[in-house]
């Protein structure tokens, strides 16, 4: 019995369906098939699951979150002994085995491995405004989403006609800040934060208004 | 304690219908397929229906097919069968069991809790 | 479906005798063989899975051996507690099948 080499790791965006492949060859009749979907999960490593099982002509569900969302892509018994997951979650991501047993065929190797990842779009960020907005300031613009996978990368723009940040400024794209030194009355206008993964963008918008001193009365 | 309890046996006419409950208690009933096997009167035992644990997998012997329908209800630790057209050959003690997975030959599985039974008598 | 024959349907021993009870599979089913005791008027009990596990707190006087068709359970020195029916069951394909029995009664 000879499982197939697997592509290595599958992504999919969180909600959508993930397909892991398993295939193998065997010299036997399908007679025998027994088949253990596990997980590693990449956030409790120490805690194998059972995801489903096929024994005896039999489906087993696993462990109690993957109950109504697996499934074999296939009808069983087959030597292609993929599985779907549905409606994935973030917890889902992990190290997926299928170990097939075929009795008599003994031998060869009997595991296949696919890494899974489950890809979330940037959630909402807020942004905010770090310090003073009186002229000749520094300031901090602050720009963060909760979720997302991969870690989103920050982008601030201005909205006016040319988009640039004011001279003064320099930006930190994977922490989402814009630092403006010496802020001046040109600093002022409408800011906006874009969030981006591999699988999605989110904005948020903040208005900068710089306070100039107010004339002395004699 | 690891408990099986079923209930709602009795007396049915031929063509009559039935429903039989399991309580479960003592273990977490919904990570569990659960079966329905049945013993004639001085006679052996016969595998009846399957539920997986979710639902999702169903079977049944070839003889109820059409007729039986299991189901379970995971809030309530609760397993059914809901027996239609009943025959005089489905006269018998119904049995709740419980399903496990072991690890041998790679995986098996084996009726491993059984409950005391409920009769069914169909007669007219 | 897979038949299991028993053999034989019931024998009569005596305390402290061995006793072998045959089970023959119409087909091969790879160990995936269990067996069950049951006292009348109660639910059957498992003593074996696989061939030849003992389940947990089933007396060690109980083994099971055999392959592809035929299958044996001995209970090496027949205890009073042990007269029952004892019954195979295949968990190799569906439908789960039975054998019909085998009594143990008291010589």
């Known amino acids: 019995l000879e499982v197939s080499e697997s592509p290595g790791s599958v992504q999919v965006a969180r909600g959508q369906t993930a397909v892991l492949p398993c295939a193998f060859s065997t010299s036997a009749a399908l007679l025998n098939l027994n088949v253990i979907w596990m997980v590693i999960p990449l956030s409790n490593a120490n805690q194998p699951e059972q995801v489903i099982l096929y024994q005896g002509g039999q489906m087993f569900d696993g462990a109690l979150r993957f109950h109504g969302r697996v499934g074999f892509t296939g009808t069983m018994p087959a030597t292609n002994v993929s599985i779907f997951i549905n409606n994935t979650q973030l917890s889902d991501t992990g190290t997926y085995q299928c170990l097939v047993n075929n009795l008599p065929d003994r031998g060869g190797r009997n595991i296949g491995v696919t890494g899974l990842t489950v890809l979330v779009p940037p959630s909402a960020p807020q942004c905010q405004i770090q310090g003073s907005q009186d002229l000749g300031s520094d300031v901090i613009l602050l720009c963060s989403s909760e979720e997302g996978i991969p870690r989103p990368t920050y982008l601030w723009e201005k909205l006016d006609n040319t988009l640039k940040l004011p001279p003064t400024a320099t930006q930190d794209q994977v922490q989402g800040t814009v630092t403006i030194r010496n802020i001046s009355a040109l600093s002022s206008g409408l800011y906006q934060c874009v969030a981006s993964n591999a699988i999605g963008t989110s904005t948020c918008l903040l208005d900068l208004q710089v306070i100039s001193p107010q004339p002395r009365s004699v | 304690e690891v408990q099986l309890v079923e209930s709602g046996g009795g007396l049915v006419k031929p063509g009559g219908s039935l429903r039989l409950s399991c309580a479960a208690s003592g273990f977490t009933f919904s990570s569990y397929s659960m079966n329905w096997v049945r013993q004639a009167p001085g006679k052996g035992l016969e595998w009846v229906s399957s539920?997986?644990?979710?639902?999702?997998?169903?079977y049944y012997a070839d003889s109820v097919k059409g007729r039986f329908t299991i189901s379970r209800d995971n809030a309530k630790n609760s397993l059914y069968l809901q027996m239609n057209s009943l025959r005089a050959e489905d006269t018998a003690v119904y049995y709740c069991v419980r399903s496990i997975i072991v690890q041998a030959l790679g995986i098996t599985s084996v009726f491993d809790i059984w409950g005391q039974g409920t009769m069914v008598t169909v007669s007219s | 479906a897979i038949r299991l024959t028993q053999s034989p349907s019931s024998l009569s021993a005596s305390v402290g005798d061995r006793v072998t009870i045959s089970c023959r599979a119409s087909q091969i089913i790879s160990n995936h063989l269990n067996w069950y005791q049951q006292k009348p008027g109660k639910a059957p009990k498992l003593l074996i899975y696989a061939a030849s596990r003992l389940q947990t707190g089933v007396p060690s006087r109980f083994s099971g051996s055999g392959s592809e068709t035929d299958y044996t359970l001995t209970i090496s020195s027949l205890q009073p507690e042990d007269f029952a029916t004892y019954y195979c069951?295949?968990?190799?394909?569906?439908?789960?099948?039975f054998g019909h029995g085998t009594k143990v009664e008291i010589k």
């Open positions: 539920i997986s644990s979710s639902s999702s997998y169903i």
């Open positions: 069951q295949q968990s190799y394909s569906n439908p789960r099948t």
